[in-house]
C-alpha cells in the first residue's frame, strides 16, 4: 500500500495493534526517482494503564472548621500499582463555600491547584470552610478534580462536600449558629439576644418563602439555680418552660440574677424547629446548655499586655513567655486567669510540659510564667496566629492573639546569573536573576546590607548611593549599579540577606555587556585568511553613542590562528602582521584579517576556536566580548559567508585557478549558503532526514 | 395578664356578611398566631383558621375557604374575623384564641353571631 | 386531614371515682422532630371558652390540679381524672395541633352519677 507524506503529516495514517506487544512493519521511501531501501519501523505496544477511584467522595465539615481529606474520602490507584506520588489530581473546579490547601504550605495563598494521593494519604490536603455571614443549617460544596498518571487515561471525579450543623463537631460543641454564654453583673439582670444565643441556623433550613411562619422552640429542661430566665417580663417556671427563636430576636428574654454570690449559674434546653402556628414539622434538633457566668460589681476586668510574636524554626519547640502571653489584673491570681484556644494555625500546636503529648486547648497564665506551656511547630513553614479568649472567671471573656512566625533553619541567596550592565549606559537594575532568598519557600520579605562595596560603581536607590535595600525594591527594578570608574569591564560586591530571623551573605558578580555586533557565519575554513571587518565585528553603535573610536584589545586567542593587519597592496613592504590592539576603524577599513589554523595533532575535520577581546570606548566601561566561530578544512566548492583573503596553499595549486586567491587584498566573492530544502515538521520529514542521508 | 376581649353579638341575615373582632392586651401582640374556633349551639367545637399578626401570614380550614377573612390591626393589637355569604348553619359563637407552642392557651369570652331572616 | 374521635360521647361517674376519655386521631400525632406528640385537652363548661388542661399528649398546663393527667402516643390517647370532683363537671375535647386544620373531637360529656 502506498501512503503519501501528506496523509503522514496530516495524522491520516493510524496504526492498529492487534497481537504482540513487540513488532512493527516494513516500508520503503520514494520520492518518485529515487526509492529507499527497505526499513523497519518498531512499534513497541503498552499494556493500557487504567487509573480507577475509589472512596466516597464526600467529605463531612464542621462548620466554620478545617477538614483533612482522607483516603475514605479520596482513594486513587492504577492497573500498575502506581506509586502514589505519581497519581495526581488537578483541581479543575474549586470549592466555593472554603478552600483547599496544603498544611505544609502557606494557608494564605494561592488556591490549591494539584495534589498526589500520597498527599492526601498523609492528612496534608485540607479543606477549611469559611463561615457565611448569612446562618444556615445544611450547605453543599463540590469539588471537580481531575486524577492523572501518564500513560493512563485522565479520570474525572467529584468530591462532594456537606458542611452540616448536624455533625458531631469536636471544636464546635453547639449545633446552633450561637451558643455563647451571657456576663452578669451580680444582683443585676442582663438580656440573653441573638449575640449569644441564636438558633437561626435551624430556621435556614426551611426554605425561604415559608421561613417567615417557621420558629424555633426552645424548651427549658433545668432552670438556673442562682436567677431567673423571663420571656415579656413573665417568668419561666416549669408549668412555663418555652420561649422562641422570634422573642430572642425580639429582645424579649431576660436572665435576672438573684444575687448572694458569684458562682456559675445557667439552663439546659432542647430547641427544634416548630412549624406555623406551632403544627409539627420535620426538621432539625439540639440538646444543649447556656453557660451564665455572674461578675463580681467591683470587678476590674483584666488588661492583655502588648503581645511579641514568637519565633521558632519549623520542627521545633519553644517555650511561650509572658513576652508572648501576659494581662495585668489586679484582683486575680495568676492560676485565675484562663485563656482558651478559639481557632489554632496549622503550623503546630500549643503543649503543656507533663500534660501529656496532645495539644492542649486551655491553659492559664500561671502555665505561662512557669515556662510549662510551649509551642510545637510541625513541618510547615507558614506563620500563622492563635486566636484566644482570656478570661479571668469574673469578666467577659476578651480576644486576644499569638502570633507564631516559623523561622527557616537556612536562607539561601540564590544567584541565578551575574549582573549585566549595558556597556554604553554604565548601569542596570538588579533582579530575582541576581539576588533572591529562598528557605523551604521564596522568602520575599528578604532585606540586604551591602558588607563590602564595589570597587568601581554604587548601589544606589532612587538615584541615591544606599548600603541597604529589600527584596521587594530589588523586585521593583528601584535597586541600580552604576560604575563610577571607567577602567574594569567587571565588579562585584558582597551582601549580607536577612529573612525570619536568619542571614546569609552572597557576593554578586557585575560584568559589563559589550555594545557589539558579532556575526561568526557558517565554518570557516582552515589554512584561509578572511577579512575582520564589520560584517564580523562591529562597534559602530558604540562608537555612535560616545562619540569616540571604540578599541579592541586581544586578550585570548585564536588557538588555532592568529589576528594580523593585512598589507594595504601589493607594494606595501612585508607580510601580515601579528595585532594585539585595533580600532573601529581599522574594522572599516577593511585592514585586518585572521589566519584560521588546522588543529594540530589530529585528523582534518571540524574544529572550533574563539577570540576574546576587550573593547573600550570613552566615559564607558570596558567589556569583554568573544566572537566564536566554527571551522573546517578548506572546501573550494563551498560558498562561504565571510570574505576570504587568501586560501591555503594546497588548494591554490590543486585548483589552478589564481582568481581563487586574491593575495591583493581585494575580498572574495561573498556567498551566504543556502538553507537546506528539507520540508519543515512531520513524520515524512523525520523520515527523509534520517534515511536519505 | 393576657386579656381577649371581643365583639359584641351580632344578628344578620343569609347572604350577609359579619365581622367579629378581637383586642388583644397584657403581651406582644405580633409575638403570637391568632386563631379563630366556632361552636355551633349544643355542638362541638371547629377550627376555622390562624394569622400571624408579624407577618399578615394567614391558614384558614378548607371549609371556609373564600368565605373567611382573617385580618390583624398591630396599631390596636386588635384581631378581626370576617364572614361572608352567611348561612343559618353559621350561627355559632366564634372564639378568638392565642395560641402558644402548639396549644390554645387563652381564648376570648366568645362573640355569638346569630344568622335568621 | 386528620381526623380525631373520642369516645365515649358521655359519661357519668361518681364523685371520688376515677373517669377516662379517650381519643383517637386518624394518623399518628408523634413528632420525629421532638418526640412530641401534638395533642392537648380542653375543659369547657358552659357559657365559657374552653380551659387548656394538657398539652404534649402528657404535660399539665400550669395551675391545673393534679388529679388531671394525660397519657398516650402516636394514635390512642386517654384522659384521666384520678378522683372526680363536682367542679369537673364539663364537656371535654382532645384536639390535635400536629397540622392544619388543627381538629378538635367531637367532645366527651362528663357528668356525676
Known amino acids: 500500500r502506498t501512503r503519501s507524506g501528506s496523509q503522514l503529516d496530516g495524522g491520516l495514517v493510524l496504526f492498529s495493534h492487534r497481537g504482540t506487544l513487540d513488532g512493527g512493519f516494513r516500508f520503503r521511501l520514494s520520492d518518485g526517482e529515487h526509492t529507499s531501501p527497505g526499513h523497519f519501523f518498531r512499534v513497541t505496544a503498552q499494556k493500557q494503564v487504567l487509573l480507577s477511584l475509589k472512596g466516597s467522595q464526600t467529605l463531612t465539615v464542621c462548620p466554620g472548621s478545617v477538614q483533612p481529606l482522607s483516603s475514605q474520602t479520596l482513594r486513587a490507584s492504577s492497573s500498575a500499582g502506581t506509586d502514589p506520588q505519581l497519581l495526581l489530581y488537578r483541581v479543575v473546579r474549586g470549592p466555593q463555600l472554603g478552600r483547599l490547601f496544603h498544611a505544609q504550605q502557606d494557608s494564605t495563598g494561592e488556591a490549591l491547584v494539584n495534589f498526589t494521593q500520597a498527599e492526601v494519604y498523609a492528612g496534608n490536603i485540607l479543606y477549611e470552610h469559611e463561615m457565611p455571614p448569612e446562618p444556615f443549617w445544611e450547605a453543599h460544596d463540590t469539588l471537580e478534580l481531575q486524577l492523572s498518571s501518564p500513560p493512563a487515561r485522565d479520570v474525572a471525579a467529584t468530591l462532594a462536600v456537606a458542611v452540616s450543623f448536624e455533625a458531631a463537631c469536636p471544636q464546635r460543641p453547639s449545633h446552633l449558629w450561637k451558643n455563647k454564654g451571657l456576663w452578669v453583673p451580680e444582683g443585676q439582670r442582663a438580656r440573653i439576644t441573638v449575640a449569644a444565643l441564636d438558633a437561626s441556623n435551624l430556621l435556614a433550613s426551611v426554605p425561604s418563602p415559608q421561613r417567615s411562619e417557621h420558629d424555633v422552640l426552645f424548651q427549658v429542661t433545668q432552670f438556673p439555680s442562682r436567677g431567673q430566665l423571663l420571656v415579656s417580663e413573665e417568668p419561666l417556671h416549669a408549668g412555663q418552660p418555652h420561649f422562641l427563636q422570634s422573642q430572642l430576636a425580639a429582645g424579649q428574654l431576660v436572665y435576672a440574677h438573684g444575687g448572694g454570690g458569684t458562682q456559675q449559674d445557667g439552663f439546659h434546653f432542647r430547641a427544634h424547629l416548630q412549624g406555623p402556628a406551632g403544627a409539627s414539622v420535620a426538621g432539625p434538633q439540639t440538646s444543649e446548655a447556656f453557660a451564665i457566668t455572674v461578675r463580681d460589681v467591683n470587678e476590674r476586668p483584666p488588661q492583655p499586655q502588648a503581645s511579641v510574636p514568637l519565633r521558632l524554626t519549623r520542627g521545633s519547640r519553644a517555650p511561650i513567655s509572658r513576652a508572648q502571653l501576659s494581662v495585668v489584673d489586679p484582683d486575680s491570681a495568676p492560676g485565675e486567669i484562663e485563656y482558651e484556644v478559639q481557632r489554632a494555625p496549622h503550623n503546630g500546636f500549643l503543649s503543656l510540659v507533663g500534660g501529656g503529648l496532645g495539644p492542649v486547648t486551655r491553659f492559664t497564665q500561671a502555665d505561662v510564667d512557669s515556662g510549662r506551656l510551649a509551642f510545637v511547630a510541625n513541618g510547615s513553614s507558614v506563620a500563622g496566629i492563635f486566636q484566644l479568649s482570656m478570661s479571668d472567671g469574673a469578666s467577659p471573656p476578651l480576644p486576644m492573639s499569638l502570633a507564631v512566625d516559623i523561622l527557616p533553619s537556612a536562607i539561601e541567596v540564590q544567584l541565578r546569573a551575574p549582573l549585566e550592565v549595558p556597556q554604553a549606559l554604565g548601569r542596570s537594575s538588579l533582579s530575582q536573576q541576581q539576588l533572591r532568598v529562598v528557605s523551604d519557600r521564596e522568602e520575599p520579605e528578604a532585606a540586604y546590607r551591602l558588607i563590602q562595596g564595589p570597587q568601581y560603581g554604587h548601589l544606589l536607590v532612587g538615584g541615591r548611593p544606599t548600603s541597604a535595600f529589600s527584596q521587594f525594591q530589588i523586585d521593583q527594578g528601584e535597586v541600580v549599579f552604576a560604575f563610577t570608574n571607567s577602567s574594569s569591564s567587571h565588579d562585584h560586591f558582597r551582601v549580607l540577606a536577612l529573612a525570619r530571623g536568619v542571614n546569609a551573605s552572597a557576593v554578586v558578580n557585575v560584568t559589563v555587556r559589550a555594545l557589539l555586533h558579532v556575526w561568526a557565519g557558517g565554518p570557516w575554513p582552515q589554512g584561509a585568511t578572511l577579512r575582520l571587518d564589520p560584517t564580523v565585528l562591529d562597534a559602530g553603535e558604540l562608537a555612535n553613542r560616545t562619540d569616540s573610536v571604540p578599541r579592541f584589545r586581544l586578550l585570548e586567542g585564536p588557538r588555532h590562528g592568529r589576528v594580523v593587519r593585512v598589507p594595504r597592496a601589493r607594494t606595501e613592504p612585508g607580510g601580515s602582521q601579528l595585532v594585539e590592539q585595533f580600532t573601529q576603524q581599522d574594522l572599516e577599513d577593511g585592514r585586518l584579517g585572521l589566519e584560521v589554523g588546522r588543529p594540530e595533532g589530529r585528523a582534518p575535520g571540524p574544529a572550533g576556536d574563539s577570540l576574546t577581546l576587550e573593547l573600550w570606548a570613552q566615559g564607558v566601561p570596558p567589556a569583554v566580548a568573544s566572537l566564536d566561530f566554527a571551522t573546517e578544512p578548506y572546501n573550494a566548492a563551498r560558498p562561504y559567508s565571510v570574505a576570504l583573503l587568501s586560501v591555503p596553499e594546497a588548494a591554490r595549486t590543486e585548483a589552478g585557478k589564481p582568481e581563487s586567491s586574491t593575495p591583493t587584498g581585494e575580498p572574495g566573492p561573498m556567498a551566504s549558503s543556502p538553507e537546506p530544502a528539507v520540508a519543515k515538521g512531520g513524520f515524512l520529514s523525520f523520515l527523509e532526514a534520517n534515511m536519505f542521508s | 395578664q393576657v386579656q381577649l376581649v371581643q365583639s359584641g353579638a351580632e344578628v344578620k341575615k343569609p347572604g350577609a356578611s359579619v365581622k367579629v373582632s378581637c383586642k388583644a392586651s397584657?403581651?406582644?401582640?405580633?409575638?403570637?398566631?391568632m386563631h379563630w374556633v366556632r361552636q355551633a349551639p349544643g355542638q362541638g367545637l371547629e377550627w376555622m383558621g390562624w394569622i400571624n399578626p408579624n407577618s399578615g401570614g394567614t391558614n384558614y380550614a378548607q371549609k371556609f375557604q373564600g368565605r373567611v377573612t382573617i385580618t390583624a390591626d398591630e396599631s390596636t393589637s386588635t384581631a378581626y374575623m370576617e364572614l361572608s355569604r352567611l348561612r343559618s348553619d353559621d350561627t355559632a359563637v366564634y372564639y378568638c384564641?392565642?395560641?402558644?407552642?402548639?396549644?390554645?392557651?387563652?381564648w376570648g369570652q366568645g362573640t355569638l353571631v346569630t344568622v335568621s331572616s | 386531614d386528620i381526623v380525631m374521635t373520642q369516645s365515649p360521647d358521655s359519661l357519668a361517674v361518681s364523685l371520688g371515682e376515677r373517669a377516662t376519655i379517650n381519643c383517637k386521631s386518624s394518623?399518628?400525632?408523634?413528632?420525629?422532630?421532638?418526640?412530641?406528640?401534638?395533642l392537648n385537652w380542653y375543659q369547657q363548661k358552659p357559657g365559657q371558652p374552653p380551659k387548656l388542661l394538657i398539652y404534649w399528649a402528657s404535660t399539665r398546663e400550669s395551675g391545673v390540679p393534679d388529679r388531671f393527667s394525660g397519657s398516650g402516643s402516636g394514635t390512642d390517647f386517654t384522659l384521666t381524672i384520678s378522683s372526680l370532683q363536682a367542679e369537673d363537671v364539663a364537656v371535654y375535647y382532645c384536639?390535635?395541633?400536629?397540622?392544619?386544620?388543627?381538629?378538635f373531637g367531637q367532645g366527651t360529656k362528663l357528668e356525676i352519677k
Open positions: 384564641a392565642k395560641s402558644w407552642v402548639s396549644w390554645f392557651a387563652s
Open positions: 397584657g403581651y406582644p401582640f405580633t409575638g403570637y398566631y
Open positions: 394518623q399518628s400525632v408523634l413528632s420525629s422532630s421532638n418526640n412530641k406528640n401534638y
Open positions: 384536639q390535635q395541633h400536629f397540622n392544619t386544620p388543627f381538629a
